[in-house]
Amino acid sequence: MSVTACQGLGFVVSLIGFAGIIAATCMDQWSTQDLYNNPVTAVFNYQGLWRSCVRESSGFTECRGYFTLLGLPAMLQAVRALMIVGIVLGVIGILVSIFALKCIRIGSMDDSAKAKMTLTSGILFIISGICAIIGVSVFANMLVTNFWMSTANMYSGMGGMGGMVQTVQTRYTFGAALFVGWVAGGLTLIGGVMMCIACRGLTPDDSNFKAVSYHASGQNVAYRPGGFKASTGFGSNTRNKKIYDGGARTEDDEQSHPTKYDYV
């Protein structure tokens, strides 16, 4: 796969993953009421990172935000933090990668700068994806722990007139947001890895330039307007100059130019 394609695909995959991370963070269905092996209720409960909701069979849905910070479980706060960090890193990663894309020309930015920016954005996407995956996994672990605790105390007997009165404890299981978060985190991670791979292809390595220099000195160079443009790629007309795969050639010259493969 060419560097441009790898970089572009990595960017698109990361972008999709990033959008998914935002969606998961905003979704209300991080945990949903467990309906299996439970008395059938006409009320369905589900919870997100920011609010909890109740949907009645009447169709009426009521959501209440968690308006306290101190009263919330530390794990929930940690998950929130991880998701927000993931989003922030993703935003920075996207901004950096836009400037790093090979298909976008900004001023006289050379490929080594683009390579560094591609690597930076790749690392940012990788960390963003990891944050999302860890966040979702921590929440899932919290749910599993609570699920088995509630199962153990599924029916707590309450003394009352006419014998024992049963209280049904609402158990929660994985909501759609968890799966969205896992997939989104994975995509962002994969996209980041692809960006890092693309960076390697963008980096001009020294041996290529030595080869070009050696080739130029061993030939009779035809002097034309533009200096050494035809042979070295370092002519005075650098307006459209680009370095592909470590070789030296210019976009506005149709003749064959030396590349690293000429010296194998």
């Epitope: 209720t41 009447s58 049963q166």
Partner: antibody, heavy 118, light 113 residues
Amino acid sequence: QVQLVQSGAEVKKPGSSVKVSCKASGYAFSNYLIEWVRQAPGQGLEWMGLINPGSGGTNYNEKFKGKVTITADKSTSTAYMELSSLRSEDTAVYYCARVYYGNSFAYWGQGTLVTVSS
Amino acid sequence: DIVMTQSPDSLAVSLGERATINCKSSQSLLNSGNNKNYLAWYQQKPGQPPKLLIYWASTRESGVPDRFSGSGSGTDFTLTISSLQAEDVAVYYCQNDYFYPFTFGQGTKLEIK
């Protein structure tokens, strides 16, 4: 305003079937569940089942499963409740009701008296 | 199924006096998700369909006089008529709106003493 108008009284022979209709108006029919409740003479209220007119999904009281079939026609905004294999103990007033906040029944039809007699 | 038990079965109260009807469910009707109790109260007069008075155990339906109030949580609920009027003579039912199948209490007949 919300209105539920039920079909008229029926007299049926044991073993036969009856289909009671409930025409809704004054609201988006597909958006609210329709519930069916019966009341035997001098007795209390008994929930039979419900239908989601939008999806056609139903939920029946176990006691009435196989006995009652609830359907809905969105084009005419009408819900139907069919009782099969009628027996004398099925003699009752049958009500349709529209669900409201808290899953309560705020709007009721006028009731349909079904009499099963040989 | 959830059993709803009303007490008393019948009640005679003087005009202007307070009337109290109790309802007990075999399981808690409190939903932890929104801290609401899924219990409704209905009034039924002879030859008429039931009329919704209270939902969510204590929320009065619009158009219902404020002399009607609902209270209670979990398994024990109360309907109170603060000052009985002649038009309040009827049968009152509580209903479980939380678990399927929805179940009603056996009814409490309210009369004037």
